[in-house]
């Protein structure tokens, strides 16, 4: 960077090299070049010569003034015009940064994804700081009072093996950068209450084509959690409004959910689960698309035969991994 050059003098910034965005700043350049009484001192920002707001302070020093500086990063250097020198002589350079102090971290959330072996803690960092900001996650056992600290730039994964102080903890986050430091509220957690079941995945769909076509969605999770509540949401790809179906689920069974949908329409399905009564949900599963077949001509019989709902042609969509062969395309 610009800071690695050999200097023949010195450049500095007031109030500081890292400062609050929107401040007025002064950049000073002082030449110390052998056998040179500078005729003129020049400032460059990101390689472009500055032409205004330059004041000569004395024989060797000049000041460049910026009002309301809004650039997150800039490389500054200054040069001198020396008598008998054809080219400008480099004096020194400095990288400067502007940004904001951190906001108070909020929405601190810690979850344990089943089988992951980690407690994952995240938070809302607030507005962009533009400068290097570090976070210290404090985890304090409510049983042993022992506190552990973890340094990170974003979220943190903490091995559950390292949480030896029982089940109850306080978690809080400190955010710090060159412009300030803030601390979140404390989050109280119980390790048994923050487990998110193994991901639920829709594997396939079939529509039994009859007077009222019935679509069966097959889905599963590898969870070992006994009491799991799930939601499946679905909508026509042309619609904005999701319909949501709720379940208390026993994964010792293969899950199959029946829907009576409109014919000849492309639908999208997603599922998510949580341990029953707990706070945190899985993220919604990958989008699963399924198009219902065109309707069979209506049979104008007096009594609608219920078993015709369960007979006839079958139209299927099958998942390959997360996305399906029928899973391409955008949601309208």
């Amino acid at each position: 960077g610009i800071t690695n050059i050999n200097c023949s003098g010195h450049i500095w910034v007031e109030p500081a090299t890292i400062f609050k965005m929107g401040m007025n700043i002064s950049i000073y350049c002082q030449a110390a070049i052998k056998n040179c009484q500078p005729r003129k001192l020049h400032f460059y920002k990101n390689g472009i010569k500055e032409r205004f707001q330059i004041t000569r302070i004395n024989k060797t020093t000049a000041r460049l003034w910026y009002k309301n500086f809004l650039e997150p990063h800039a490389s500054m250097y200054c040069t001198a015009e020396c008598p008998k020198h054809f080219q400008e002589t480099l004096i020194c350079g400095k990288d400067i940064s502007s940004g904001y102090p951190p906001d108070i971290p909020d929405e601190v959330t810690c979850v344990i994804y089943e089988y992951s072996g980690n407690m994952t803690c995240t938070w809302n960092a607030g507005k962009l700081t533009y400068i290097d900001t570090k976070y210290v996650v404090h985890v304090k056992s409510l049983e042993t009072e022992e506190e552990q600290q973890y340094l990170t730039s974003s979220y943190i994964n903490i091995s559950t093996d390292s949480l030896q102080g029982g089940k109850k903890y306080l978690v809080w986050v400190q955010a710090a950068n060159a412009l300030g430091m803030e601390e979140s509220k404390q989050l109280q957690i119980h390790l048994d209450d923050i487990v998110i079941p193994s991901a639920a995945v829709i594997s396939r769909a079939e529509t039994i084509n009859a007077t009222v076509p019935k679509t069966i969605i097959y889905w599963d999770s590898q969870t070992t959690i006994e009491k799991v509540s799930c939601e499946m949401r679905y909508k026509a790809t042309t619609n904005q409004t999701w319909n949501v179906k709720e379940f208390d689920t026993n994964f010792t069974y293969v899950q199959q959910s029946e829907f009576y949908l409109e014919p000849n329409i492309k639908y999208v399905f997603q599922v998510r689960c949580q341990e029953t009564g707990k706070r945190y949900w899985q993220p919604w599963s990958s989008l699963f698309f399924h198009k219902t077949p065109e309707t069979v001509p209506q049979v104008t019989s007096k009594a609608f035969q219920h078993d015709t709902w369960n007979s006839g042609l079958t139209v299927a969509s099958i998942s390959t991994g997360h996305l399906t062969s029928d899973n391409r395309g955008d949601i309208g």
């Epitope: 199959q256 829907f259 709902w309």
Partner: antibody, heavy 117, light 107 residues
């Protein structure tokens, strides 16, 4: 012809229990979600509980959670609702309905549950 | 919970007339609405689902319309046998909820 026949209703004291049954015929019972829907004396309709075709998932409204349990026996083509810790506000006509989601195309004739001291 | 409001508890009409029964959802339910008819002393019967699709065997004088929050069941050429309570139901979100019903009286 689709037929749903409920039984097991009656007069019970608050805190008591009842088990409702619904015998289904005329369709492939084992391949549809089934529900219990109740209608209060004021004629309000309310979905009480729902069970998927293979019994792998269920839904109960919050007011009955922990007190009522829906179950099914596909071999016997029968739907059940086990009701315990009954309250006066559970007094209603209980209907067995098919399919149990998203709407109810077929209803039984209903069985009356009266919770009173 | 989504509240389904049927503002008219009673509606009166004559044979051969056209009547519209309305239902308002407390939030957007898309087109996930069904309508039921319940005649005195009988169980409810499904008339309409997905807002406007008639259930098998339902006469075409029954039509459903609407979307979002406002829904209507229209009976054209009302017949004497249409004397009943009519209920709307949303299945967009759990708990699935019903309107309180509109009693259609024939003059």
């Amino acid at each position: 012809e689709v037929k749903l026949v409920e039984s097991g209703g009656g007069l019970v004291q608050p805190g008591g229990s009842l088990k409702l049954s619904c015998a289904a015929s005329g369709f492939t019972f084992s391949s549809d979600t089934m529900s219990w829907v109740r209608q209060t004396p004021e004629k309000r309709l309310e979905l009480v509980a729902e069970i998927s075709s293979n019994g792998g998932s269920t839904y109960h409204i919050d007011t009955v959670k922990g007190r009522f349990t829906i179950s099914r026996d596909n071999a016997k083509n029968t739907l059940y609702l086990q009701m315990s810790s009954l309250k006066s506000e559970d007094t209603a006509m209980y209907y067995c309905a098919s399919p149990g989601y998203p709407w109810f195309a077929y209803w039984g004739q209903g069985t009356t549950v009266t919770v009173s001291a | 919970d989504i509240v389904m409001t049927q503002s008219h508890r009673f509606m009166s009409t004559s044979v051969g007339e056209r009547v519209s029964i309305t239902c308002k959802a407390s939030q957007d339910v898309g087109n996930a609405v069904a309508w039921y008819q319940q005649k005195p002393g009988q169980s409810p019967k499904l008339l309409i689902y997905w807002t406007s699709t008639r259930h098998n065997g339902v006469p075409d004088r029954f039509t459903g319309s609407g979307s979002g929050t406002d829904f209507t069941l229209t009976i054209s050429n009302v017949q004497g046998e249409d004397l009943a309570d009519y209920f709307c139901q949303q299945y967009n979100r759990y708990p699935l909820t019903f309107g309180s019903g509109t009693k259609l009286e024939i003059k």
